[in-house]
Amino acid sequence: FTITVSKDLYVVEYGGNVTMECKFPVEKQLNLFALIVYWEMEDKKIIQFVNGKEDLKVQHSSYSQRAQLLKDQLFLGKAALQITDVRLQDAGVYCCLIGYGGADYKRITLKVHAPYRNISQRISVDPVTSEHELMCQAEGYPEAEVIWTSSDHRVLSGKTTITNSNREEKLFNVTSTLNINATANEIFYCTFQRSGPEENNTAELVIPERLPVPASERT
């Protein structure tokens, strides 16, 4: 009796959904009452399917209303765990254990990332010095550095602060400001750069013709 997995690594975005699968040998018909399915993550019990039904009493509270075993897939020999509204804390090594005549288990790794996609931007001007303050802010995971560039590809020196998000403990709130003398219609870019390939998110900031005081906000 051998369980197989088509993927042993799943990468999912924060807030998205994921379905992890373990396949087990099944005859033309399935006897639900002889099937045992456990899904666990470290010390947290997520699914306990015994005697033809899920025992929700043992489910760890952090997965409540978010994790379910897809029953229709069992008849195809698949123990499919679906997690909705994925959180950063969901990342880790999952174990599916299946008893159906024989018994076996497999491990699957879930990685969760949160791109710095929704970048808020603000442009303000100091009425005394006429210096512009450009600000970009976004939440994501893991930590990112912010690179400021001009339209002629010059790298500029900004100041970045990283705090914890109010939304979720593990999310980072990254804010970066650039103080610069600029003229109307000049274009600047803030790029949130995480480790890994193609993990960059960029916002374009255009200096307006005139700025009211107090500073306006553009999103």
Epitope: F1, T2, F24, P25, V26, E27, K28, Q29, L30, N31, F33, A34, I36, V50, L97, G99, Y100, G101, G102, A103, D104
Partner: antibody, heavy 119, light 108 residues
């Protein structure tokens, strides 16, 4: 090499008890379901009892329900059949068989142990 | 409960084809297994999942299953194939195993 060796068969009086044992070797015992199948003299095969590998799920033939109990000790690589309230019609060769990984079939069988119930 | 019906006996001439049938209600929707049992010996699994052969089982043994009948075919039967043959399926998979009554094959 997979081996299943049964023992415990004997001549016993009606209403008596017997405990059959089957010692397994040559495979990871805790990963397979095990069964007892019997064959009365000059008759066909009948599944007596089944136990799954993992959670101790069991199943019995109607003819033995409430009288026979199947159990396993994964540490000792052994499956047992406790037979109580024996009847003449329980007389048979009792085979221990290994489940074929999540299927209803039996891919390895022991040579059997004979149980005779007679006064 | 589920019933599997086999003919008590079948004869075949040496090196001819023997067909042993196993009848059951909608048996084609279930998996069928076949065992060979020689006199004084334990049964041996020769076909599983309708038509698959375990390693070590000669190619002359084949199986098919559809509708209400499963068939074990022995192409070019040999004297050593003389034995009782049992089909097996289930009412409920795993826990509801059912055997046919057995067919005694005689090789002439």
């Amino acid at each position: 090499e997979v081996q299943l060796v049964e023992s415990g068969g004997d001549l016993v009086k009606p209403a008596g008890s017997l405990r059959l044992s089957c010692v397994a070797s040559g495979f990871t015992f805790s990963s397979y379901s095990m069964s007892w199948v019997r064959q009365a003299p000059e008759k066909g095969l009948q599944l007596v009892a089944w136990i799954d590998a993992y959670a101790g799920v069991t199943s019995y033939a109607n003819a033995v329900k409430g009288r026979f109990t199947i159990s396993r000790d994964n540490a000792k690589n052994t499956v047992y059949l406790q037979m109580n309230s024996l009847r003449a019609e329980d007389t048979a060769m009792y085979y221990c068989a290994r489940g074929q990984g999540g299927r209803s079939s039996f891919d390895y069988w022991g040579q059997g142990t004979l149980v005779t119930v007679s006064s | 409960s589920y019933v599997l019906t086999q003919l008590p006996s079948v004869s075949v001439t040496l090196r001819q084809t023997a067909r042993i049938t196993c009848g059951g209600d909608s048996i084609g929707s279930k998996n069928v297994y076949w065992y060979q049992q020689k006199l004084g010996q334990a049964p041996v699994l020769i076909i599983y999942d309708d038509s698959s052969r375990p390693s070590g089982i000669p190619e002359r043994f084949s199986g098919a299953n559809s509708g209400n009948t499963a068939t074990l075919t022995i192409s070019g039967a040999l004297a050593e194939d003389e034995a009782d043959y049992y089909c097996q399926s289930y009412d409920i998979p795993l826990t509801g195993t059912v055997f046919g009554g057995g067919t005694q094959l005689t090789v002439l």
